[in-house]
C-alpha cells in the first residue's frame, strides 16, 4: 500500500478500562497528532478506519463491528465497547485516509479486572485535599459522553470495600463526594459506580481515585532553614573533610517548585574551581510537607576554603530565604614540648 504517516505506538496513551463495562475511546490522532479535528477531516472526505492487534499476536486484523448487540461500534472519532471483554486487550490503530492522504497511530488498550473492593491494576488518579480546610469535593471522573443529559444515572460511592452511607464527615451528593473536613484518616481509595440504562440494558461505570490529604495553604509558610544555623560552627583544620548540611522545611504548596542550592562566595558550586560535591535527600511528612537536605562536601579543605562564604538558599512559591554557615579554621592545639614549655620560661 502507499506511504502512510505512521505515528507508531503511542504508549503515553496507555488506556485502561474495566472488564464488562462500557468504554469510549477517542482516536488520539485528533487530540495529539493532527492540527485539525474529526469534523474537518470528515468534511474533506477523509475516512477513519479502525483495526487492532490482539495481545501477544503480531497480526493486524479489522475490528468486528457486527457483533451481537453492537458490542463494538464506531461513532465519529470514538470507538465504543458496550461492554468490554477481557480479551479486547491489545493494540488499537486508527487510520485517517483518502486516496492522497494517510495518517495513523496505534495505542495500547488494557482491559483489567477489579475485585469487590475495587482493587485492580488500574493506575489511579490522585486528588489532593487540604487538611482541615472546610468543605471540599471530589467528582466522579471520566463519565462524560456515556449517556445523554436526559438520563439520570444512579451513583453509589465507596471507600475501599464499604458503601459510603451515614459517614459522619463524607457525604455522597450525586456525582460529587463532599468531605466536610478532610483529615489524614480520609486518605485512601474512593470509588463511584455510575449505573445507567441504555436500550433496555443496564451499564455500570466504575471510577476509582486516590485521595491524599495534604498541608493546607492556610498553614503554609516560606521555606524554613533548620541548618546551617547560628548555633553550629564548622571548625576544621586544613586537610580535613568539610561537611555542611543544608536542611530546609517546605510547607506543602500545590504546584510549587521547591529549590535548595548552595553558593560559595556568591557563586554556584559548578562555577568555581574547588572540588565540591553536593548530595541531596528528600523526605515527606504525611501531609506532603517536604524536608530537603543538601550536604556540601569538600574532601580536603584548604585554609583558603575555610575563609570562604558558604550560603544555603531556598525558594518556594511562598518566598526565598538564605542562611550562611559559620565556617572557621581550627586554631591548632599547642604542642606541649615546644610552645608550652617556652611559655613557662624553659630554655
Amino acid at each position: 500500500s502507499e506511504r502512510c504517516d505512521d505515528w507508531g505506538l503511542d504508549t503515553m496513551r496507555q488506556i485502561q478500562v474495566f472488564e464488562d463495562e462500557p468504554a469510549r475511546i477517542k482516536c488520539p490522532l485528533f487530540e495529539h497528532f493532527l492540527k485539525f479535528n474529526y469534523s474537518t477531516a470528515h468534511s474533506a472526505g477523509l475516512t477513519l478506519i479502525w483495526y487492532w492487534t490482539r495481545q501477544d499476536r503480531d497480526l493486524e486484523e479489522p475490528i468486528n463491528f457486527r457483533l451481537p448487540e453492537n458490542r463494538i461500534s464506531k461513532e465519529k472519532d470514538v470507538l465504543w465497547f458496550r461492554p468490554t471483554l477481557l480479551n479486547d486487550t491489545g493494540n488499537y490503530t486508527c487510520m485517517l485516509r483518502n486516496t492522497t492522504y494517510c495518517s495513523k497511530v496505534a495505542f495500547p488498550l488494557e482491559v483489567v479486572q477489579k475485585d469487590s473492593c475495587f482493587n485492580s491494576p488500574m493506575k489511579l488518579p490522585v486528588h489532593k485535599l487540604y487538611i482541615e480546610y472546610g468543605i471540599q469535593r471530589i467528582t466522579c471522573p471520566n463519565v462524560d459522553g456515556y449517556f445523554p443529559s436526559s438520563v439520570k444515572p444512579t451513583i453509589t460511592w465507596y471507600m475501599g470495600c464499604y458503601k459510603i452511607q451515614n459517614f459522619n464527615n463524607v457525604i455522597p451528593e450525586g456525582m460529587n463526594l463532599s468531605f466536610l473536613i478532610a483529615l489524614i484518616s480520609n486518605n485512601g481509595n474512593y470509588t463511584c459506580v455510575v449505573t445507567y440504562p441504555e436500550n433496555g440494558r443496564t451499564f455500570h461505570l466504575t471510577r476509582t481515585l486516590t485521595v491524599k490529604v495534604v498541608g493546607s495553604p492556610k498553614n503554609a509558610v516560606p521555606p524554613v532553614i533548620h541548618s546551617p544555623n547560628d548555633h553550629v560552627v564548622y571548625e576544621k583544620e586544613p586537610g580535613e573533610e568539610l561537611l555542611i548540611p543544608c536542611t530546609v522545611y517546605f510547607s506543602f504548596l500545590m504546584d510549587s517548585r521547591n529549590e535548595v542550592w548552595w553558593t560559595i562566595d556568591g557563586k554556584k558550586p559548578d562555577d568555581i574551581t574547588i572540588d565540591v560535591t553536593i548530595n541531596e535527600s528528600i523526605s515527606h511528612s504525611r501531609t506532603e510537607d517536604e524536608t530537603r537536605t543538601q550536604i556540601l562536601s569538600i574532601k580536603k579543605v584548604t585554609s583558603e576554603d575555610l575563609k570562604r562564604s558558604y550560603v544555603c538558599h531556598a525558594r518556594s512559591a511562598k518566598g526565598e530565604v538564605a542562611k550562611a554557615a559559620k565556617v572557621k579554621q581550627k586554631v591548632p592545639a599547642p604542642r606541649y614540648t615546644v610552645e608550652l614549655a617556652c611559655g613557662f620560661g624553659a630554655t
Epitope: 475485585d115 473492593c117 470495600c161 452511607q165 484518616s185
Partner: antibody, heavy 120, light 107 residues
C-alpha cells in the same frame, strides 16, 4: 505489631444484653474497620457487622439488625459490640477482627475471642 | 446472601500426605475468597486471600486455587501442626459469608 485484646467471658440471662470490648494496638485505630464475627459451639463463623471509627460508620448483617449495636471509642482505641434480647442460641464465641485496610475483604488480625453463655 | 459450602465435612489424612479441601459458592465470587485455619480454643488464622495468594508467614505447602464458584485449598504434605478446621470466606458481596468448615484429622 497489631493486637486485638477482647474482654473476658460472660454469662447472661435470656432477654438481657451483653457488651463485648476489643482494644486495638498497633496502627492508628481510626484508620481501620473493625468487624465482629461469632462462632456458636461446634459451628462455623458468622459475620455480624462492623464499624469504621474514623467515619462513625456502622454496617450490620440483616440477621442482627436492630439487635446488635457496634460502637467505638477513639480515645481508648476500643471497639464494642452490644447484643440485646439474648436467647440461648446466642451462646457463642464472639471475635473482633480487622482487615489490613479499607480495601481488603479478608481478616488479617483477630482478637482472642470472648465466650458469651446465655443460660437461665 | 451467598452460601458457601465446604466439603468434605471431615477429612482423615496421614501426616506427610496431601489434603485437598473444597469450597463451593452459591454464585460467582470471582477470586474474592479467603481461607482460614482454626485450632481448638484459638482464633482463626488467615492462610490465603484472593483465592491463591498466601498470607505473610504461611508455608509454601498451603496453596489455593479456583475462581467463580469452585475453590480448592491444598496442603501438599500434612505436618502435625496442620490438623485443624479450615474455613473459606467470600468477600465478593455483602454480607461476607463463611463456609461451615472442614475438619482435617489424623488418620
Amino acid at each position: 505489631q497489631v493486637q486485638l485484646v477482647q474482654s473476658g467471658a460472660e454469662v447472661k440471662k435470656p432477654g438481657s444484653s451483653v457488651k463485648v470490648s476489643c482494644k486495638a494496638s498497633g496502627g492508628v485505630f481510626s484508620y481501620y474497620a473493625f468487624h465482629w464475627v461469632r462462632q456458636a459451639p461446634g459451628q462455623g463463623l458468622e459475620w455480624m457487622g462492623g464499624i469504621i471509627p474514623g467515619y462513625g460508620a456502622t454496617f450490620y448483617a440483616q440477621k442482627f439488625q436492630g439487635r446488635v449495636t457496634i460502637t467505638a471509642d477513639e480515645s481508648t482505641s476500643t471497639a464494642y459490640m452490644e447484643l440485646s434480647s439474648l436467647r440461648s442460641e446466642d451462646t457463642a464465641v464472639y471475635y473482633c477482627a480487622r482487615p489490613v485496610s479499607y480495601s481488603s475483604g479478608w481478616y488479617d488480625y483477630w482478637g482472642q475471642g470472648t465466650l458469651v453463655t446465655v443460660s437461665s | 446472601e451467598i452460601v458457601m459450602t465446604q466439603s468434605p465435612a471431615t477429612l482423615s489424612v496421614s501426616p506427610g500426605e496431601r489434603a485437598t479441601l473444597s469450597c463451593r459458592a452459591s454464585q460467582s465470587v470471582s477470586s474474592n475468597l479467603a481461607w482460614y485455619q482454626q485450632k481448638p480454643g484459638q482464633a482463626p488464622r488467615l492462610l490465603i486471600y484472593g483465592a491463591s495468594t498466601r498470607a505473610t508467614g504461611i508455608p509454601a505447602r498451603f496453596s489455593g486455587s479456583g475462581s467463580g464458584t469452585e475453590f480448592t485449598l491444598t496442603i501438599s504434605s500434612l505436618q502435625s501442626e496442620d490438623f485443624a478446621v479450615y474455613y473459606c470466606q467470600q468477600y465478593n458481596n455483602w454480607p461476607w459469608t463463611f463456609g461451615q468448615g472442614t475438619k482435617v484429622e489424623i488418620k
